[in-house]
């Protein structure tokens, strides 16, 4: 099993739609279950975007390039929720997302109709297939939701900006 999310980071505007893409290939001939999971940041990322990240976090991440203080922590230290799941042609939204314009399209892409402030975080595309427990079954994209200030100076470097 191989799962790939082509965009590692994405910036989108508040109240605008966005699509988080996900591709997968599998040796299994059985239908796959697609699940998108949301994980909050380990610590507040907005502070960093405004130039207020802690010196401790900065020094730690400089010392250890593999570890990111915003992204790397036990799930028990942050919020984890299922956004949506797709089995066959049936898409089911997680309890927290019921009533939102959210669906899974093109096999495994997550389509969000209107972004909210709390949507910033990590989105994991997880594929489950029978007979295939080798390889890579998930990949993630970091989504940052910004308000329309008219200024792009607030943006984190290396984020691809999507203004619809």
């Amino acid at each position: 099993l191989q799962v790939t999310v082509p965009d590692k980071k994405k910036v989108a505007m508040l109240f605008q739609p966005t699509v988080l893409r996900c591709h997968f290939s599998t040796s299994s001939h059985q239908p796959a279950v697609v699940q998108w999971k949301f994980k909050s940041y380990c610590q507040d990322r907005m502070g960093e975007s405004l130039g207020m990240s802690s010196t401790r976090a900065q020094s730690l991440s400089k010392r250890n390039l593999e570890w990111d203080p915003y992204l790397d922590c036990l799930d028990s230290r942050r919020t984890v929720r299922v956004v949506a799941s797709k089995q066959g042609s049936t898409v089911t939204l997680g309890d927290f997302y019921r009533g939102r314009e959210i669906t899974i399209v093109h096999d495994a892409d997550l389509q969000i109709g209107k972004l909210m402030w709390g949507d910033s975080g990590l989105y994991y595309c997880i594929i489950t297939t029978p007979d295939d427990l080798e390889g890579k079954n998930e990949d993630s994209v970091e989504l940052l939701v910004l308000g329309r200030t008219g200024l792009l100076a607030d943006l984190l470097p290396s984020f691809a900006v999507e203004i619809m």
Epitope: L74, S76, V80, S85, T128, L133, N137, E138
Partner: antibody, heavy 121, light 107 residues
Framework: EVKMVESGGGLVQPGGSLKLSCATS????????MYWVRQTPEKRLEWVAY????????YYPDTVKGRFTISRDNAKNTLYLQMSRLKSEDTAMYYC??????????????WGQGTLVTVSA | DIVMTQSHKFMSTSVGDRVSITCKAS??????VAWYQQKPGQSPKLLIY???YRYTGVPDRFTGSGSGTDFTFTISSVQAEDLAVYYC?????????FGGGTKLEIK
């Protein structure tokens, strides 16, 4: 064939130290997150530590944090667990374990045979 | 951490019987639950993952079901070699946690 062989267990006094090793073969070790899981005398299974494939991220439960250190040598395909300030409640069979997927949330598809650590005066 | 609870520490059954072992998660874990079998003197062995998928080489008398917080592992026709301790585990969020185990005894 995936193989994982633990060693280094034994009898140690409270407050003592021990270093466990897990020699692996049959897979690309440097691709995988690796785990130490222990089984208490009451047969409860609990995770002890895990480490990212590159070794830069390590995680521990509060019960062992500050006393245990997980590390790896990707050139030698070996996982380690340095245990210090050992307590009687650390007495257990220690297993190294590997998930099925090299990246992603999946259960432990592969386990070593275990090495027994006994902490007793 | 998510707590996994197996309410029965022991279950007694006869060869040929159908037996079900239950596991309850302290919070929603979707379908990310695995079941392991541990025979005396051996390491745990993965049987079921993602609540209902049989791992490679596992006989089809072993099945799993459930989602959310309630999960069931079933052996449709118990064999003498199924004498073991069975553990559930959530693989939804780190740290992955295990149930306390259910020891299956053959009458």
């Amino acid at each position: 064939e995936v193989k994982m062989v633990e060693s280094g267990g034994g009898l140690v006094q409270p407050g003592g130290s021990l270093k466990l090793s897990c020699a692996t073969s049959g897979f690309t070790f440097s691709d995988y997150y690796m785990y130490w899981v222990r089984q208490t005398p009451e047969k409860r299974l609990e995770w002890v530590a895990y480490i990212s494939n590159g070794g830069g991220s390590t995680y521990y439960p509060d019960t062992v944090k500050g006393r245990f250190t997980i590390s790896r040598d990707n050139a030698k395909n070996t996982l380690y667990l340095q245990m210090s300030r050992l307590k009687s409640e650390d007495t257990a069979m220690y297993y190294c374990a590997r998930q099925g997927y090299y990246y992603g949330s999946s259960p432990f598809a592969y386990w070593g045979q275990g090495t027994l650590v006994t902490v007793s005066a | 951490d998510i707590v996994m609870t197996q309410s029965h520490k022991f279950m007694s059954t006869s060869v040929g019987d159908r037996v079900s072992i239950t596991c309850k998660a302290s919070q929603d874990v979707s379908t990310a639950v695995a079941w392991y079998q541990q025979k005396p003197g051996q390491s745990p062995k993965l049987l079921i993952y993602s609540a209902s998928y049989r791992y490679t080489g596992v006989p089809d008398r072993f099945t799993g079901s459930g989602s959310g917080t309630d999960f069931t592992f079933t052996i449709s026709s118990v064999q003498a070699e199924d004498l073991a301790v069975y553990y559930c585990q959530q693989h939804y969020s780190t740290p992955y946690t295990f149930g306390g185990g259910t020891k299956l005894e053959i009458k």
